[in-house]
């Protein structure tokens, strides 16, 4: 679709004379008509086969015509046309005297004629004027022409229809070819699908509008390359979405089940080495001169009491050193100078000759100690206590003070954490060394048995002769849906044989 | 051949939600080359269009229902479906799936056989 | 709002032309559809992109498209064509629909 224009610009006729050579009255009031087909050798009458247009008076014997595209688009004419434009025409001018206001052929003499030209050739679509001029013995013609494509219409024969758009079927302009031209950010055939944000993962992100990375369910991040893990996944990453993989030290379902204590807790102190020994257990291996549970005391050489005979003890950066009383030496003062004459049995102890006189031992009474029976019984010393108990002197007596989970004289019992009766649907419960385990009967799980798992109750075959098997999952028993012929609540009696009762 | 069924209930009650779903056989709704739509008609009027989505779920409402409006896909089962809540008598109509094609310049080549939808207590 | 006005209705005698219009602000900017409803049926695509017949619909169904109106025309209309015709147009990205026009062929 397109338009072949003509522009009229200058017509000459100095003598203002007909095509017959008899003069105008008064003047040639001139007017024309524009016939334009398709390509002949020789143009020769007939029909019009790309249109007609005819002007009104543009003037009298010789004038120019102004362009009058603004006022009603006379001036260029304008011969439209719905086909493709083959690249080569057929154009007659005619140039006509109109003695009055009526300008039908019919209504005009046939000598009413004042010039006639005919032009035929090759025009190419395009937005150039080709200027052309005519001259016959009498009058002169100037004018121009073009062909140029119809709104929406391109390429060089105006055969293709492109329309720009910018919604949902296409965000594009029209090329001069009629191809799609992308508006930035667009792509596709024709231009609807949106360029996304640069990175956006191409099977788990999208877009709706450029520069855009919207995320598929269970992906998220900026590209949309992360996925997203279990909901409640505490210490645990993900390769698809919804899995929750512990990260090293973590355990359980969600990751949540502390597997190294040591290592996010750092319990032991002072250098000590610490053991994972469960879920939130550890120990700790303390270095010389700590103790407590997690190595936290620091222990004075002196606490073991080295020094022998009543030697008082000095505790030094690289060890101690025993002051000795008189008569006594030696790195622990073990070396005695006495004998029992010199009565060294301190507290009533009495005293025995050794080595022909030379040495002594002091027999104590209850409740003292040491070589001169010179110390208290210090019922603690021993650290009798175990697993981690505190020993308190009480007098002539000890008490062990003990640490969560244990008890006894000594802190010698394992509190049994079973004996709460921590498993829930009657679940078995063990001791362990650091906790308990529960064992889920069928149809439960968690750490506690606390979740129902519905058992599958048709899974051993309940129902006989073929008869359709279904799971109560509130009580996890079956039910069976006989075929035809039979009864019973396993399907297993034919409809007319009665069972046979054992009364 | 490409075919689009409608279903969903006939009856529903004045405001409550409206809900329909389209599926699409012979072709895949995951094709880059159409948007799915949905297009009503009241008894004895003319067409009003409803709203259409993109397989990747981009939706386009129409500004009128656009507040009531949802249309989703489910590309696993080849579906798309609409919503239309706080429903009224004024949206008794047939409701008719459709396939709009890019190529065609937003033509819809194929279209559902309609589901009638009365809004009435 | 982007409106498309059709004429109710437009009689044709069997064998002549009927022209059906559809007016819109610019409408030739954009691409028209023509569809073809006949009772109790679903609608049928004729015409898309102003003037093209998808396959299988008849010669005698063309379109055009310029100024502020779209046109349907049938030539040698039968009395199968007897039927409602609706035009469509993309308005943004709002679908819009004519009113319709009830094509009688007397």
């Known amino acids: 679709s397109g338009v072949f224009q003509l522009q009229l610009q200058e017509f000459i006729n100095e003598r203002g004379v007909l095509a017959s050579g008899r003069p105008c009255e008064p003047g040639c009031r001139t007017f024309f008509r524009v016939c334009l087909k398709h390509f002949q050798a020789v143009v020769s009458p007939g029909p019009c086969t790309f249109g007609t247009v005819s002007t009104p008076v543009l003037g009298t014997n010789s004038f120019a015509v102004r362009d009058d595209s603004s006022g009603g688009g006379r001036n260029p004419l304008q011969l439209p046309f719905n086909f493709t434009w083959p690249g080569t025409f057929s154009l007659i001018i005619e140039a006509w005297h109109a003695p009055g206001d009526d300008l039908r052929p019919e209504a005009l003499p046939p000598d009413a004629l004042i010039s006639k030209i005919a032009i035929q050739g090759s025009l190419a679509v395009g937005q150039n004027w080709l200027l052309d001029e005519q001259t016959s013995t009498l009058t002169r013609l100037r004018y121009s022409y073009r062909v140029i494509c119809s709104d929406n219409y391109y390429g060089d024969n105006c055969s293709r229809l492109c329309k720009k758009r910018n919604d949902h079927f296409g965000h594009y302009v029209c090329q001069p070819d009629g191809n799609l031209s992308c508006l930035p950010g667009w792509t596709g055939e024709y231009c609807q699908q949106p360029i996304c944000l640069s990175g956006c993962h191409e099977q788990n992100g999208y877009c709706s509008k450029p520069a855009e990375c919207l995320c598929r369910p269970g992906w998220q991040g900026r590209l949309c390359n992360e996925c997203i893990p279990h909901n409640g996944c505490r210490h645990g990453t993900c390769s698809t979405p919804w899995q929750c993989t512990c990260d090293e030290g973590w355990g359980g379902l969600f990751c949540d089940q502390d597997l190294n204590y040591c290592t996010h807790h750092s319990p032991c102190k002072n250098g000590a080495t610490c053991s994972n020994s469960g879920q939130r257990s550890y120990t700790c291996t303390c270095r010389p001169g700590y103790t407590g549970v997690d190595c936290e005391l620091e222990l004075s050489e002196c606490d073991s009491n080295p020094c022998r005979n009543g030697g008082s003890c000095k505790d030094q950066e690289d060890g101690y050193h025993c002051l000795c009383p008189p008569g006594y030496y030696g790195l622990h003062c073990e070396h005695s100078t006495l004998s029992c004459a010199d009565s060294p049995c301190f507290n009533g102890g009495s005293c025995r000759e050794r080595n022909q006189g030379a040495n002594y031992a002091c027999e104590c009474p209850p409740n003292f100690t040491g070589s001169n029976c010179e110390k208290k019984v210090d019922r603690c010393t021993s650290n009798p206590c175990a697993n981690g108990g505190q020993c308190l002197n009480r007098g002539p007596s000890r008490m062990c003070r003990c640490r969560p989970g244990f008890t006894g004289t000594y802190c010698e019992l394992h509190v049994s954490d079973c004996a709460r009766n921590p498993c829930a649907h009657g679940g078995t419960c063990h001791d362990l060394e650091n906790g308990l385990m529960c064992t889920c009967p069928a149809g439960f799980s968690g750490r506690r048995c606390e979740v129902r798992t519905s058992i599958d109750a048709c899974a051993s075959s309940p129902c006989f002769n073929r008869a359709t098997c279904y799971t109560d999952l509130s009580t996890d028993t079956f039910v069976c849906n006989c075929p035809y012929g039979f009864v019973g609540s396993r399907c297993e009696f034919p409809v007319g044989l009665p069972p046979s009762f054992p009364w | 051949e490409v075919q689009l069924q409608e279903s969903g209930p006939g009856l529903v009650k004045p405001s409550e939600t409206l809900s329909l779903t389209c599926t699409v056989s012979?072709?895949?709704?995951?094709?880059?080359?159409?948007?799915w739509g949905w297009i009503r008609q009241p008894p004895g009027k003319g067409l009003e269009w409803i709203g259409d989505i993109y397989y990747t779920g981009s939706t386009y409402y129409n500004p009128s229902l656009k507040s009531r409006v949802t249309i989703s896909v489910d590309t696993s089962k080849n579906q798309f479906s609409l919503k239309l809540s706080s429903v009224t008598a004024a949206d008794t109509a047939v409701y008719y799936c459709?396939?709009?094609?890019?190529?065609?310049?937003?033509?819809?080549?194929?279209w559902g056989q309609g589901t009638l939808v009365t809004v009435s207590s | 709002l982007y409106v498309l006005t059709q004429p109710p209705s437009v009689s044709v005698s069997p064998g002549q032309t009927a022209s059906i219009t559809c007016s819109g602000q610019r409408l030739g900017d954009k691409y028209a559809s023509w569809y073809q409803q006949k009772p109790g049926q679903s609608p049928v695509l004729v015409i898309y992109?102003?003037?093209k017949r998808p396959s299988g619909i008849p010669e005698r169904f063309s379109g055009s498209n310029s100024g502020d109106t779209a046109t349907l025309t049938i030539s040698g209309t039968q009395t199968m064509d007897e039927a409602d015709y609706l035009c469509q147009a993309w308005d943004r990205d709002t679908g819009v629909f004519g009113g319709g026009t009830k094509v009688t062929v007397l």
């Open positions: 992109e102003d003037s």
């Open positions: 012979g072709g895949s709704i995951s094709s880059s080359s159409y948007y």
């Open positions: 459709a396939r709009e094609d890019v190529i065609l310049r937003g033509g819809s080549d194929y």
